[in-house]
């Protein structure tokens, strides 16, 4: 029960986290104009990974996409890449984890398979969360560097061109969304990995047990995995516990016609 709860909670937390990573990646407010100690302007600038926007006091907002790839800073490209990798891994992790959930039965999937899938999705969530946190942190570092550079030189004259007020940018809402979302995805992934341990068949060696079916011998090797003929429903690796006790989730397996081919 605790394993199911841990797995379910891990899935939900990761789902929220990945939704947050997607939201952060799409948001325009990665960096926002710093209003502290600045002349009060009737224009508010903010930038995202994909476009920059200007909101006028009049209420009009104009956004312009970055229609160049080569002209963009390498750091911005790296952040984009990290966020996309995070989303892709997270999405695959979600897909895998849906099939791994104990509360969902798909055919005759075994606990060991579900355990492996849970672990896989958990690792994917952890990597996804780390990608998001890394991406947001790289962007934040870029902002801090630029902030102090522009503070040192508030007004710049570009090679004889017209002076422009050096707009300083500070952390936007997307950074905080990204950090929180990355953290949630990471936590969700850890929870999935913990749940995997509870789902996985124990590796302890048990006494060899023989079960004699009429006309056919099926041996149970130490380690508890059934050596079957490789056909039909009996190919499932069922765990035999001492005294023949089974877990409540385990369905008894009877010899089928395929065992006697």
């Amino acid at each position: 029960m605790a394993v199911t709860a841990c797995q379910g909670l891990g899935f939900v937390v990761s789902l929220i986290g990945i939704a947050g990573i997607i939201a952060a990646t799409c948001m325009d407010q990665w960096s926002t104009q710093d209003l502290y100690n600045n002349p009060v302007t009737a224009v508010f600038n903010y930038q995202g990974l994909w476009r920059s926007c200007v909101r006028e006091s009049s209420g009009f907002t104009e956004c312009r996409g970055y229609f160049t790839l080569l002209g963009l800073p390498a750091m911005l490209q790296a952040v984009r890449a990290l966020m996309i990798v995070g989303i892709v891994l997270g999405a695959i992790g979600l897909l895998v984890s849906i099939f791994a959930l104990k509360c969902i039965r798909i055919g005759s999937m075994e606990d060991s398979a579900k355990a492996n899938m849970t672990l896989t999705s958990g690792i994917m969530f952890i990597v996804s969360g780390l990608c998001a946190i890394a991406g947001v942190s790289v962007f934040a570092n870029m902002l801090v560097t630029n902030f102090w550079m522009s503070t040192a030189n508030m007004y710049t004259g570009m090679g004889g061109m017209v002076q422009t007020v050096q707009t300083r940018y500070t952390f936007g809402a997307a950074l905080f969304v990204g950090w929180v979302a990355g953290g949630l995805t990471l936590i969700g992934g850890v929870m999935m990995c913990i749940a995997c341990r509870g789902l996985a068949p124990e590796e302890t060696n048990y006494k060899a047990v023989s079960y004699h079916a009429s006309g056919h011998s099926v041996a149970y090797k130490p380690g508890g995995f059934k050596a079957s003929t490789g056909f039909g429903s009996n190919t499932k690796n069922k765990k035999i516990y001492d005294g023949g006790a089974r877990t409540e989730d385990e369905v008894q397996s009877y010899p089928s016609k395929h065992d006697y081919v």
Partner: antibody, heavy 118, light 113 residues
Framework: QVQLQQSGAELVKPGYSVKLSCKAS????????INWVRQRPEKGLEWIGW????????KYNENFKGKATLTTDKSSSTAYMQLSRLTSEDSAVYFC???????????WGQGTLVTVSA | DIVMTQSPSSLTVTAGEKVTLSCKSS????????????LTWYQQKPGQPPKLLIH???TRESGVPDRFTGSGSGTDFTLTISSVQAEDLAVYYC?????????FGAGTKLEIK
């Protein structure tokens, strides 16, 4: 078409208050800010402040804080400016104008002449 | 506050002449975010409210004759009337729309001979 209809001329005694109105028509009142501008005789234009009818957000020129109070009534699509503690210096024509691209003022009311005299 | 300096303060011209009105701001009105200059030109005829001619320093408002052209960037701006007509008799104001408080120039009075 867009129209801003302002209230009629006012003759006020010094120290008193006056409330000017600006009724908007021809557009969605809550979507655009309303600015107020003062023009004194033989003087230029002075921006007083703006109000967004949608959420009531205001921004004032520091020189008019405490002097002007901007409000709106969404039901009647009307913007108001109350001028308090009037002096002869406040005698002027007051315009309301709708915010537009580039923070410019696109549609103007016809103006309200306020005369402060004992 | 941003000071908007207009020159000349008044100007007398004959119909058909080309006129250039100047406006200088004490600080740049160029926004780095969208590379637009937040300067507006208005025309005020006697007994009327001001009328918007040009916003963003060079974007002509719809319905404004194309003889009116705005140019300039940063701190120096000009309004050019390519061929002055009798109906252009008015006071022309420039406005800072970038910094609060939004400030106007003292105006240039255009008179026709």
């Amino acid at each position: 078409q867009v129209q801003l209809q302002q209230s009629g001329a006012e003759l006020v005694k010094p120290g008193y208050s006056v409330k000017l109105s600006c009724k908007a028509s021809g557009y969605t009142f809550t979507n655009f800010g309303i600015n107020w501008v003062r023009q004194r005789p033989e003087k230029g234009l002075e921006w007083i402040g703006w109000i967004f009818p949608g959420d009531g957000t205001t921004k004032y020129n520091e020189n008019f804080k405490g002097k002007a109070t901007l409000t709106t009534d969404k039901s009647s699509s009307t913007a108001y400016m109350q001028l308090s503690r009037l002096t002869s210096e406040d005698s002027a024509v007051y315009f309301c104008a709708r915010f537009y691209y580039g923070n410019s003022f696109v549609n103007w009311g016809q103006g309200t002449l306020v005369t402060v005299s004992a | 506050d941003i000071v908007m300096t207009q020159s000349p303060s008044s100007l007398t011209v004959t119909a058909g002449e080309k006129v250039t009105l100047s406006c200088k701001s004490s600080q740049t009105l160029l926004n780095s975010g969208n590379q637009k200059n937040y300067l507006t030109w208005y025309q005020q005829k006697p007994g009327q409210p001001p009328k918007l001619l040009i916003h963003w320093a060079s974007t002509r408002e719809s319905g404004v004759p194309d003889r009116f052209t705005g140019s300039g960037s940063g701190t120096d701006f000009t309004l050019t009337i390519s061929s002055v007509q009798a109906e252009d008799l008015a006071v022309y104001y420039c406005q800072n729309n970038y910094f609060y408080p939004l400030t106007f120039g003292a105006g240039t009075k255009l008179e026709i001979k």
